[in-house]
């Protein structure tokens, strides 16, 4: 107690006793004092530090008529539902001016089964995967032992014999409980139980079968399920996002995928109404009767250019001349991959085909020799990738140029003579 | 409000004593320890001590015990402190000051405006 | 007895600025997991005005210019920003044991 000038005697007449109890215990501690005139608050100390928020009460009795006779104080704190936390030392404190009294101590133990701070929890493991599950229990009393039950059985012959805090298990080919029990001189505690659900391993070796422009199969090797068969496989497709790409581990595509499921086996799948020459990420989960593995990483891939699936639009040929002028437009339909050009073809009535190579541009003039008198001349255009030439034009005929007709503004081409542009009866 | 009354100044004999006072009022006299603070001038405070003025009880700084009496008239509301055997060392300014208690011990948070005491022949 | 030895001596501050006083105890003035230590202001001619109780709580009607900190046996008040009035003395107090002693004091002028 604080230095003070008298030897004062402490006012405590009845100090806290002791309370020695199993969790959830409620008690109260009682301390006494008798002092003259005026009475003090009284405090409750534990381990030597004020408890702000003590469930405290204090009853004060005159002992006589007048204020200077003496008072019984008595200061009650109750201890609801006992936790470890609430162990140790306690003691009354009072303040008489600038003197300090305390009581002497009392002490709050805790003893009784042991107390779980963690207990196995539920989860997911993949079929013949090692894994850990924790459990930990605390007294008083010390010491406590853990013993281990997988489907209820123990997994050593004693309590501490075995795996304490972690158990490690190797793998496991079928869903299974775990629990942990503790044991103290008091008796023993059961956890709670466990489920470790068995989910097939992630299926592995994601690989491209074949490819064509709007499909893709591809096939994968399954991980192992347990005693689990496999009920079927999801393939998922997504469109790459330019520039951003899905990263090896990304979890979750830029949009919303293309889902697909396969039947197993065979683990393959064929990927249908996709883009052509497209990249695309694809990955794949299995699932058995207890769920679905872990998603493979996206794998990238892509479906190659294919050919131009309409031929060009608005072919007019018309001619004036020794000049046919032919202009098109690009096809409406899809052309499955990067336009390279266009190839003209055109025939006279009892001729042969001539073809040629026009490249990107979209009209030519011909540059006819002789006086252009040969009849039911026709033309055909086709686009092409580098997959080849999409379907050709229906034969377009050469008209004959009337003035006020428009007459497309272009460069005028003169075909190179080698090979000659020449009809032979000319 | 609480109000400390002490009276300005005293003047005494060496060898004499004094008796200073300090009437409370504003709040309930008995409730609150009473203090007795001494300054020099130009120089720190100096606890001299304390009583309880519901039963007399006293807390002494040692140096003055043989020194300071503390006494309290509650009827008046009024605390006293006689000073024996003065000498120069005696001169001093002494102040009353209220204990008030805060959530768990006191502070003088009230303090009356000091007796100017002069010890010369 | 515990000493509290306070420092500076004396200090001169700019209106608006900020002003700090250390107090440091011979021995911890904690106790019970409390701080025992009062800060005082002392205009000149007039009575200690309690500013700060247990370390860092104020004072009725003390403005919250004034800041207490500090444990065991350092502590510091906090005057930001200080204005024209705060010229003074400061004291501080451990009331931890009997006797409660005083530091020696800082005198705070403002410029």
């Known amino acids: 107690a604080p230095r003070g000038t008298q030897a004062e005697e402490s006012p405590f007449v009845g100090n806290p006793g002791n309370i020695t109890g199993a969790r959830g215990l409620t008690g109260t501690l009682r301390c006494q004092l008798q002092v003259q005139g005026e009475p003090p608050e009284v405090h409750w100390l534990r381990d030597g530090q004020i408890l702000e928020l003590a469930d405290s009460t204090q009853t004060q009795v005159p002992l006589g008529e007048d204020e200077q006779d003496d008072w019984i104080v008595v200061s009650q704190l109750r201890i609801t539902s006992l936790q470890l936390s609430d162990t140790g030392q306690y003691q009354c404190l009072v303040f008489l001016g600038h003197q300090t009294f305390v009581s002497q101590p009392g002490y709050v133990g805790l003893e009784g089964l042991p107390y779980f701070l963690e207990e196995p929890e539920d989860r997911t493991v993949a079929a013949n995967t090692p894994f850990n599950l924790s459990c930990q229990a605390q007294g008083p009393p010390e010491p406590v032992d853990l013993l281990w039950l997988q489907d209820a059985v123990p997994l050593a012959t004693a309590p501490g014999h075995g795996p304490q805090r972690s158990l490690h298990v190797p793998g496991l080919n079928k869903t299974s409980s775990f629990s942990c029990e503790a044991h103290n001189a008091k008796g023993v505690t059961t956890s709670r139980t466990a489920t470790i659900t068995v989910l097939p391993q992630q299926p592995r070796n994601l690989h491209l079968v074949s490819r064509q422009p709007t499909e893709l199969e591809v096939a994968w090797t399954p991980g192992l399920s347990g005693i689990y068969p496999l009920t079927h496989c999801t393939l998922q497709a997504v469109l790459s996002d330019d520039g951003m790409g899905i990263q090896a581990g990304e979890p979750d595509p830029p949009e919303e995928p293309l889902t697909s499921q396969a039947s197993v086996p065979p683990h393959q799948l064929r990927l249908g109404s996709l883009h052509p020459h497209t990249p695309y990420h694809i990955r794949v989960a299995c699932t058995s009767s207890q769920g679905p593995s872990s998603w493979t990483h996206w794998l990238p891939v892509e479906t190659p250019e294919g050919v131009p699936l309409g031929p060009p639009e608005n072919i007019s040929a018309t001619r004036n001349g020794s000049q046919a002028f032919v202009h098109w437009q690009e096809p409406r339909a899809p052309l499955q991959g990067t336009l390279l050009g266009y190839r003209l073809a055109y025939q006279g009535q009892d001729t042969p085909e001539v073809l040629m190579d026009i490249g990107l541009r979209q009209e030519v003039t011909l540059e006819l020799q002789g006086d252009g008198s040969v009849s039911n001349l026709t033309v055909c255009v086709a686009a092409y990738t580098a997959a080849g030439d999409g379907p050709w034009s229906l034969p377009v005929p050469l008209e004959a140029w009337r003035p006020g007709q428009a007459q497309p503004v272009h460069q005028l081409v003169k075909e190179p003579s080698t090979p000659a542009f020449s009809w032979p009866w000319w | 409000q609480v109000q400390l009354q002490q009276p300005g100044a005293e003047l005494v004999k060496p060898g004499a004593s004094v008796k200073l006072s300090c009437k409370a009022s504003?709040?309930?006299?008995?409730?609150?320890?009473m203090n007795w603070v001494k300054q020099r001038p130009g120089q720190g405070l100096e606890w001299i001590g304390e009583i309880n003025p519901s039963n007399g009880r006293t807390n002494h700084n040692e140096k003055f015990k043989s020194k300071a009496t503390l006494t309290v008239d509650k009827s008046s509301s009024t605390a006293y402190m006689q000073f024996s055997s003065l000498t120069s060392e005696d001169s001093a300014v002494y102040y009353c000051a209220r204990s008030g208690y805060g959530k768990y011990y006191s502070a003088m948070d009230y303090w009356g405006q000091g007796t100017s005491v002069t010890v010369s022949s | 007895d515990i000493v509290l030895t306070q420092s500076p001596a004396s200090l001169a501050v700019s209106l608006g600025q900020r002003a700090t006083i250390s107090c440091r105890a011979s021995?911890?003035?904690?106790?019970?997991?409390?701080?025992?230590m009062n800060w005082f202001q002392q205009k000149a001619g007039q009575p200690p005005k309690l500013l700060i109780y247990?370390?860092?709580n104020q004072g009725s009607g003390v403005p919250a210019r004034f800041r207490g900190s500090g444990s065991g046996t350092d502590f510091s008040l906090n005057i930001h920003p200080v204005e024209e009035d705060d010229t003074a003395m400061y004291f501080c107090?451990?009331?931890?044991?009997?006797?409660?002693?005083f530091g020696g004091g800082t005198t705070l002028e403002i410029k």
């Open positions: 504003g709040y309930t006299f008995t409730s609150k320890w």
């Open positions: 021995e911890s003035v904690d106790n019970y997991g409390i701080s025992f």
């Open positions: 107090q451990q009331s931890k044991e009997v006797p409660p002693t």
């Open positions: 247990a370390a860092s």
